[in-house]
């Protein structure tokens, strides 16, 4: 009686169980009553990462520099190429199929968390007493200058984008 199911690493074809091709190889011809499954190694730019019956190997992933990608790990006949983001860029998702430059925090905002290869810059509004007058992916909010410690007085109040302006104390004659 012909089989209805096959063992692991086998597949059913023409009422018989054939061996799957091992990772790194593709199927050339199915087995017969008299011959084994015929498999061929994938070429240098291709891979197959599972026991399979694929007639074509998969092309290695291209780490497209136009998408900010670079090779982290070169592919083999059994593994795909792994891409990562170029310096100064981060992935647009966990799968990292493209990268974008880190966002800068605008004036009035400071960097709460510096970007990594997988996460963007996190900005926070500068609270009262702090300011940022630059657009930056690295700078935190800076505290207003303390005029008192310099024996000066506040001539112009600070904002979230500007420092206080200090000036000399009015002398009583």
């Amino acid at each position: 009686e012909p089989p209805t199911a096959c063992r692991e690493k086998q597949y059913l074809i023409n009422s018989q169980c054939c061996s799957l091709c091992q990772p790194g190889q593709k199927l050339v011809s199915d087995c017969t009553e008299f011959t084994e499954t015929e498999c061929l190694p994938c070429s240098e730019s291709e891979f197959l990462d599972t026991w399979n019956r694929e007639t074509r190997c998969h092309q290695h992933k291209y780490c497209d520099p136009n998408l900010g990608l670079q090779v982290q790990q070169k592919g083999t006949s059994e593994t795909d190429t792994i891409c990562t983001c170029e310096e100064g860029l981060h992935c647009t998702s966990e799968s990292c199929e493209s990268c974008v430059p880190h966002r800068s925090c605008l004036p009035g905002f400071g960097v709460k968390q510096i970007a990594t290869g997988v996460s963007d810059t996190i900005c926070e509004p500068c609270p009262v007493g702090f300011f940022s007058n630059v657009s930056s992916a690295f700078e935190k909010c800076r505290p207003w200058t303390s005029c008192e410690t310099k024996d000066l007085v506040v001539q112009q109040a600070g904002t979230n984008k500007t420092d206080v302006v200090c000036g000399p104390q009015d002398r009583q004659r």
Partner: antibody
């Protein structure tokens, strides 16, 4: 050759659930994500959602409650399920290679009409 | 919700004209923007990635520029095969993956 191809019903009744399948060849779903994009007749493209190469699913905020995207890496298929279909959902539905990224490889699209 | 606003929605031009299409994001998307060309009955074709990088096989008369919230697609000298609809698409993150409303370039 790298290809993606949509298949599923061409006609769906209002309130019914739409199930579309994207079958891929020439690449592994463990290496690339797949997204679904639709286009109502004479209107703009709308990104519905996608599934990353790591299996993470992403959805457009307006479609989250109605959409499910899943995959079978062995069958090389990505499945879109959209509940509570309405005539305004009449559109050409495309699958494209890529998750949260750009889409260089598209299927030919399948026109789904929602009508009683 | 995040939005991409494309303008104009349509334009008429002649062969040889310089054509400019703009796309504005409702929040900064750095350079996470792509441009596509679509002809009737066909899927879109990728033209520009990363706001300014030409996709493979795309003629050099197409160019893209911009960063943050304001982006531009320029066709330096319009050819007969360029009459089509053009879309921008952001891909900065999953919450900002959307397409613009499209710009139809018609023959004057």
């Amino acid at each position: 050759e790298v290809t993606v191809k949509e298949s599923g019903p061409v006609l769906v009744k209002p309130t019914e659930t739409l199930t579309l399948t994207c079958t891929v060849s020439g690449f592994s779903l463990s290496s690339y994500g797949v997204s679904w994009i639709r286009q109502p007749p004479g209107k703009a493209l709308e990104w519905l959602g996608g599934i990353g190469s790591d299996g993470s699913a992403y959805y457009a905020s307006w479609a989250k409650s109605r959409l499910t995207i899943s995959r079978d890496t062995n069958l090389k298929q990505v499945v879109l399920t959209m509940t509570n279909m309405d005539p305004v959902d009449t559109a050409t539905y495309y699958c494209a290679r890529g998750g949260i990224t750009v889409y260089a490889m598209w299927g030919q699209g399948t026109l789904v009409t929602v009508s009683s | 919700a995040f939005q991409l606003t494309q303008s104009p929605s349509s334009l008429s031009a002649s062969v040889g004209d310089r054509v400019t299409i703009t796309c504005q994001a409702s929040q900064s998307i750095s350079t996470g923007l792509a441009w596509y060309q679509q002809k009737p009955g066909k899927p879109p074709k990728l033209l520009i990635v990363g706001a300014s990088n030409l996709a493979s096989g795309v003629p050099s008369r197409f160019s893209g520029s911009g960063s943050g919230t304001d982006f531009t697609l320029t066709i330096s000298s319009l050819q007969p095969e360029d009459f089509a609809t053009y879309y921008c698409q952001s891909y900065f993150s999953s919450s900002s993956t959307v397409f613009g409303g499209g710009t139809k370039v018609e023959i004057k």
